[in-house]
């Protein structure tokens, strides 16, 4: 049991995890397999489930981070946060109840996820016992981006981060001292979690605006297999 000031993780129950504490892709957990009579997932449910799957992965990664360092209780995070340009939802992005705008919001979600990719790459060598989960979060985020890109009417408005800038940022982050690397890991996980939560709320407002084709096997489709990428 442990606690951090970002939330209470004492009841760390994760929907898509099996007994080995490994992430199970949506559609592959025992609940899905045991319910062949269930209706196939709709497109919006697919995306919804994919985001929740990623969030569960983040939850597991944060558990390891908070257990091995005191970053989760640190009051110095504001200082470190100023040096990171992590994507964040704001009123102008059209994703909140007030001033909601489907198109603007969808562009923000995709742009934000693309911007997070470099930070997810940074996370890949930051975990010992949760290495697979870090990889799963990264790969399933790529799939989520693809799902959403298929549905964005205004693809021109989506700015893709510059690979050279990303490579330079990655080098800079990896060159930090141990304390700053731990803090960076904590801040990335916290910010990514918040961004996905905001996205989930917004996508639920959109409802069936999102329509990813559902294959004939319904809910049994693997959501995060690398072959899909």
């Amino acid at each position: 049991d442990y606690k951090d000031h970002d939330g209470d993780y004492k009841d760390h129950d994760i929907d898509y995890k099996d007994d080995d504490d490994k992430l199970v892709p949506p559609g592959e957990d025992s609940k899905d397999v045991a319910a062949p009579h269930r209706q196939p997932l709709t497109s919006s449910e697919r995306i919804d489930k994919q985001i929740r799957y990623i969030l569960d992965g983040i939850s597991a990664l944060r558990k390891e981070t908070c257990n091995k360092s005191n970053m989760c209780e640190s009051s110095k995070e504001a200082l470190a946060e100023n040096n990171l340009n992590l994507p964040k939802m704001a009123e102008k992005d059209g994703c909140f109840q007030s001033g909601f705008n489907e198109e603007t919001c969808l562009v923000k979600i995709i742009t934000g996820l693309l911007e997070f990719e470099v930070y997810l790459e940074y996370l890949q060598n930051r975990f010992e016992s949760s290495e697979e989960q870090a990889r799963a979060v990264q790969m399933s985020t790529k799939v989520l981006i693809q799902f959403l890109q298929k549905k964005a009417k205004n693809l021109d408005a989506i700015t893709t981060p510059d690979p050279t800038t990303n490579a330079s940022l990655l080098t800079k982050l990896q060159a930090q001292n141990q304390w700053l690397q731990d803090m960076t890991t904590h801040l990335i996980l916290r910010s990514f979690k918040e961004f996905l939560q905001s996205s989930l709320r917004a996508l639920r407002q959109m409802g069936d605006l999102i329509s990813v084709p559902v294959d004939s096997r319904g809910s049994e489709q693997k959501l995060i297999s690398e072959e899909d990428l």
């Epitope: 000031h5 970002d6 939330g7 209470d8 993780y9 009841d11 760390h12 129950d13 994760i14 929907d15 449910e45 919804d48 489930k49 985001i51 929740r52 969030l55 569960d56 939850s59 964040k88 939802m89 909140f96 109840q97 909601f100 918040e194 961004f195 996905l196 939560q197 905001s198 989930l200 709320r201 639920r204 407002q205």
Partner: antibody, heavy 118, light 109 residues
């Protein structure tokens, strides 16, 4: 960890009123927070949430008349154009943040009574 | 996303079993919580995500359901279980009148 509401009192119809919820033992900035009310002898009625991303969501009936804001130690509920129907005990509650959007309310204050009467 | 709770009131004998139902107007993907409220007290979280018991809650309380239909079952009812029980959807907070059901009063006889 605890929450305590304050500011409830007897007011006349049309009077604006602000209720404050104060946290002890934790920082509110890391949690989704909610206001819920309960008229005498009635059920729970959700007013709204303020999330960690600073966004606010309100019940359809509360939009425009109720407003939620937050600091690291307090959550305020601003109410305008009060009528007798707004007479209720007002609770603030903390959302659990261990997961995604499952906004369960795992810590509640004792409530503060607002009476609207002429 | 309206939540309809039934029955409004139920009498149960000590040691008996009581079942409370909650129906959502649309699927809420198992994001449903149950609360217990006693007179003069704030609500207390009992169950979240349909079936997970909150810390310190007796295993006599059991939650189940999926999609739009959810159930709270209290077995081996005790005097202390006399209270009003509410369901709450945690799925969507947009275009909602109330995230809570209307409540069920459990009277132990």
């Amino acid at each position: 960890q605890s929450l305590e509401e304050s500011g409830g009192r007897l007011v006349t119809p049309g009077t604006p009123l602000t209720l404050t919820c104060t946290a002890s033992g934790f920082s509110l900035s890391s949690y989704d927070m909610s206001w819920v009310r309960q008229a005498p002898g009635k059920g729970l009625e959700w007013i709204g949430y303020i999330y960690t991303d600073t966004s606010t969501y309100y019940a359809n009936w509360a939009k425009g008349r109720f407003s939620i804001s937050k600091t690291s130690t307090t959550v305020d509920l601003k109410m305008t154009s009060l009528t007798a129907e707004d007479t209720a005990t007002y609770f603030c509650a903390k959302g659990s943040t261990d997961y995604a959007f499952d906004t369960r309310l795992d810590l509640w204050g004792p409530g503060t009574l607002v009476t609207v009467s002429s | 996303y309206d939540m309809t709770q039934t029955p409004a009131s139920v009498e149960v004998a000590m040691g008996g079993t009581v079942t409370i139902k909650c129906q959502a107007s649309q699927s809420i993907s198992n994001e449903l919580s149950w609360y217990q409220q006693k007179p003069g007290q704030p609500p207390k979280l009992l169950i979240y995500r349909t079936s997970t018991l909150a810390s310190g809650v007796s295993s006599r309380f059991k939650g189940s359901g999926s999609g739009t239909e959810y159930t709270l079952t209290i077995s081996g009812v005790e005097c202390a279980d006399a209270a009003t029980y509410y369901c709450q959807q945690g799925y969507n907070s947009n275009d909602v009148d109330n995230v809570f059901g209307g409540g069920t009063e459990v009277v132990v006889v």
